[in-house]
């Protein structure tokens, strides 16, 4: 049987080494074990009595079905337990009683059908993040389940298999700042939501079909929400479920953000929010973002007329892969206080954009991201938005554009350009001598010579360039990035004649360790002040000798540097 | 209805070994915990060892430790106490018990941990 292996601050790891029991030559000195993935099976009274100065204990995926009564009586300073994923088919409080310096347990991925007999917390006053539940056993909240708790960071339930849900069950945890609720069904969603209205401050739901979801209203008193922020993740929907889950907003007046991943609409986007004050509710919500979301009718999906009054006030949003090849005129106009627009991974043409992008449309917008879409011209692209007037931030990187011209035309106040990995292999003035920050990495380029009198950020990481770019073209330049490219020196005339950099990145370049270049890294500590990740990332490709050492280690032979 | 039997004490010199055997019939014990306890004349019942179903994870009592071994047979649903370098203060009756239900809220070093519980063996260390 294989050991643990421990370093010197008592972190100790065994896991996947094929432990059947709880290894013995445990010691105070250890602060974290970790035994996961083993076939543990059984924890029993004296198996970590040695451990009294344990602070992470780790058994997570180790066949434990059995753990007696007071087998962690003397985890007294223990402050994270993972049981997760084991074969735990009841929970007894009894293990938990000793464990009053607890901060983070999961008790998650165990057959269990309920929490146990009694309360298994009241003693965990200090926890700060509790996961529990199961995909297909875990079918019964109760009252008494979350007694003595009375604040959480992050409380996570699993109850896909929900068939029972008793009213006020999480009411008793007066603050939750972010609760993950994994239901498959809808059924006790209202009942959950007017207990938590008063506590959660992020609500987040995982893998619910709504699609019958019928808002009716909520038995609670004027509550004062602290809910700033409302996810659904892997939920299905209707244009019908859609409106119904509007009507929940009427109850979370702070509401400031909600998010959409990896759902499915079964619908048209045939949105009727049927409440005209559901409208001034949204007033709040400042961002919306929406990633993956599958419409499997997406050809027939509407314009989305019925719901851009509900936008009006919104200043970020994001869509995500989800096939969008257009956004109507109408609806960017009405985006009134849009700020940023991501449209990464979609669909977008230069022909569509132009619509998207028409007079008067988002008239606040500073930052427009479109990358990995199907743009070609960057020509093209720059006289499209030039509509936007306060636009300021353009990111268009992975489109595949075809070389560039001589000359381009850009909104006037751009100052951030990302062109990364769009195959570019020339740079030409096309680019807007305006810019502040330009990003060209993961490119073709060999050479850049293109004078950016504003310019403070160049990153042309992932390039095939030999030399550094020459310092007369970016006489303001603070921070550089040209790793991974094929510069083989740098020497003190070049770096000092960057007046203003503070940070050069550099590294896994082709070094060539020459007299010169080991003398200037030996003479100079302050290199370490500016290069990034110096000493490590910077060694010598040749001489042959010297391969593979760091610059700051290679010493030169005195036979080559005093001929 | 569960019964286990004890067998294999006896009278032992100092310094002897002593192997217990404790056969538990009707039930099946493929789940069960099984314990050895010892209680010298006028002391209290006091806990030796115990081992798990699949023999995975064992315990000694501070009495036990470096000088007694506990295993067990599966198949033939036996559990064993090897006893070596055996002295005066070990002179006891050694009682074997089983422990069938699946839920552990309490400790295996308590007698109110298990089920069921055999007569007894008699284990004599002569000086």
């Known amino acids: 049987q294989e050991s643990l292996s421990c370093d010197a601050s008592g972190v100790c790891d065994g896991r996947s080494r094929s432990f059947t029991s709880i290894p013995s030559g445990l010691t105070a000195a250890m602060k974290s074990l970790d035994l996961s993935f083993n076939k543990i099976t059984y924890i029993g009274h004296g198996d970590l009595r040695a451990c009294a100065n344990l602070q992470v204990l780790i058994l997570k995926s180790s066949r434990i079905n059995t753990i007696e009564g007071d087998a962690f009586y003397s985890l007294g300073s223990l402050e994270h337990l993972d049981l997760s994923d084991n074969h735990l088919s009841s929970l007894s409080s009894s293990w938990f009683g000793p464990l009053s310096s607890l901060k983070y347990l999961n008790l998650m991925g165990n057959p269990y059908q309920t929490l146990g007999v009694t309360s298994l917390f009241p003693n965990l006053t200090n926890l700060q993040t509790l996961r529990i539940g199961n995909v297909e056993t875990f079918s019964e909240i109760r009252r008494i389940d979350f007694a003595g708790l009375t604040s959480l960071n992050e409380l996570e339930i699993k109850a896909l298999s929900l068939r029972n849900y008793q009213s006020q069950s999480l009411k008793s945890i007066r603050d939750i700042h972010h609760l993950t609720l994994h239901l498959s069904e809808s059924a006790f969603l209202l009942e959950i939501f007017a207990d938590i209205l008063s506590s959660v401050r992020y609500l987040e739901l995982r893998d619910t079909n709504l699609a019958r979801f019928q808002f009716s209203p909520l038995p609670v008193d004027e509550v004062s929400s602290p809910m700033k922020k409302l996810a659904f993740r892997g939920s299905v929907l209707t244009d019908e479920s859609f409106n119904e889950l509007l009507k929940l907003l009427r109850y979370i007046l702070e509401l400031s953000e909600v998010e959409f991943d990896d759902c499915t609409l079964n619908g048209l986007g045939d949105f009727n929010p049927s409440e005209s004050d559901v409208v001034s509710e949204l007033g709040k919500v400042e961002t919306v973002t929406i990633r993956r979301l599958h419409i499997p009718q997406f050809y027939l999906f509407y314009d989305l007329s019925t719901v851009y009054s509900l936008l009006e006030k919104v200043k970020r949003i994001t869509v995500e892969n989800s096939k969008v090849f257009l956004v109507p005129c109408s609806f960017s106009q009405h985006l009134k206080s849009l700020e940023f627009l991501d449209l990464s991974e979609n669909l977008m043409v230069e022909e569509y954009l132009k619509n998207s992008a028409c007079k008067g449309a988002w008239p606040s917008l500073q930052t427009l991201v479109l990358s990995q879409n199907h743009l070609r011209s960057m020509q093209k692209t720059g006289e499209i938005l030039l509509t936007l007037k306060n636009l300021t931030s353009l990111d268009i990187s992975r489109n595949t554009f075809h070389p560039m011209p001589d000359s381009c035309q850009w909104p006037e106040k751009m100052r951030f350009l990302n062109l990364s990995s769009t195959g570019i292999r020339v740079v030409k003035t096309c680019i807007p001598q305006t810019l502040e920050v330009l990003d060209v990495s993961n490119n073709n380029l060999d050479s850049f010579s293109l004078f950016l009198p504003r310019l403070q950020e160049l990153y042309i990481s992932r390039n095939k360039l030999k030399t550094l770019p020459d310092a007369s073209l970016f006489p303001v330049l603070l921070v550089m990035k040209i790793r991974e490219n094929a510069v083989s020196t740098f020497s003190k005339d070049q770096l000092g004649s960057f007046p203003k950099l503070e940070t050069l990145e550099a590294g896994d370049n082709h070094f060539v360790c020459s007299c010169e270049l080991l003398s200037f890294t030996m003479e100079t500590p302050a290199l370490a002040q500016i290069l990034v990740d110096w000493p490590d990332s910077y060694l010598c490709d040749s001489p042959p000798r010297l391969h593979g050492h760091r610059l700051q280690d290679a010493r030169p032979s005195v036979l080559e540097c005093h001929q | 209805e569960v019964q286990l039997v004890e067998s294999g004490g006896g009278l032992v010199q100092t310094g002897g070994s002593l192997r217990l055997s404790c056969a538990a019939s009707g039930s099946t014990f493929s789940k069960a915990v099984m314990g050895w306890f010892r209680q010298a004349p006028g002391k209290e019942r006091e806990f030796v060892a115990r081992i798990t179903w699949n023999g995975g994870s064992t315990y000694y009592g501070d009495s036990a430790k470096g000088r007694f071994t506990i295993s067990r047979d599966i198949g033939k649903t036996t559990a064993y106490l090897l006893m070596n370098s055996l002295q005066p203060e070990d002179t006891a009756n050694y009682f074997c018990?089983?422990?069938?239900?699946?839920?552990?809220?309490?400790?295996?070093?308590?007698?109110?941990?298990?089920?069921?519980w055999g007569q007894g063996t008699q284990v004599t260390v002569s000086s």
């Open positions: 018990a089983a422990r069938m239900r699946p839920v552990f809220s309490s400790s295996s070093v308590q007698e109110s941990f298990y089920d069921y």
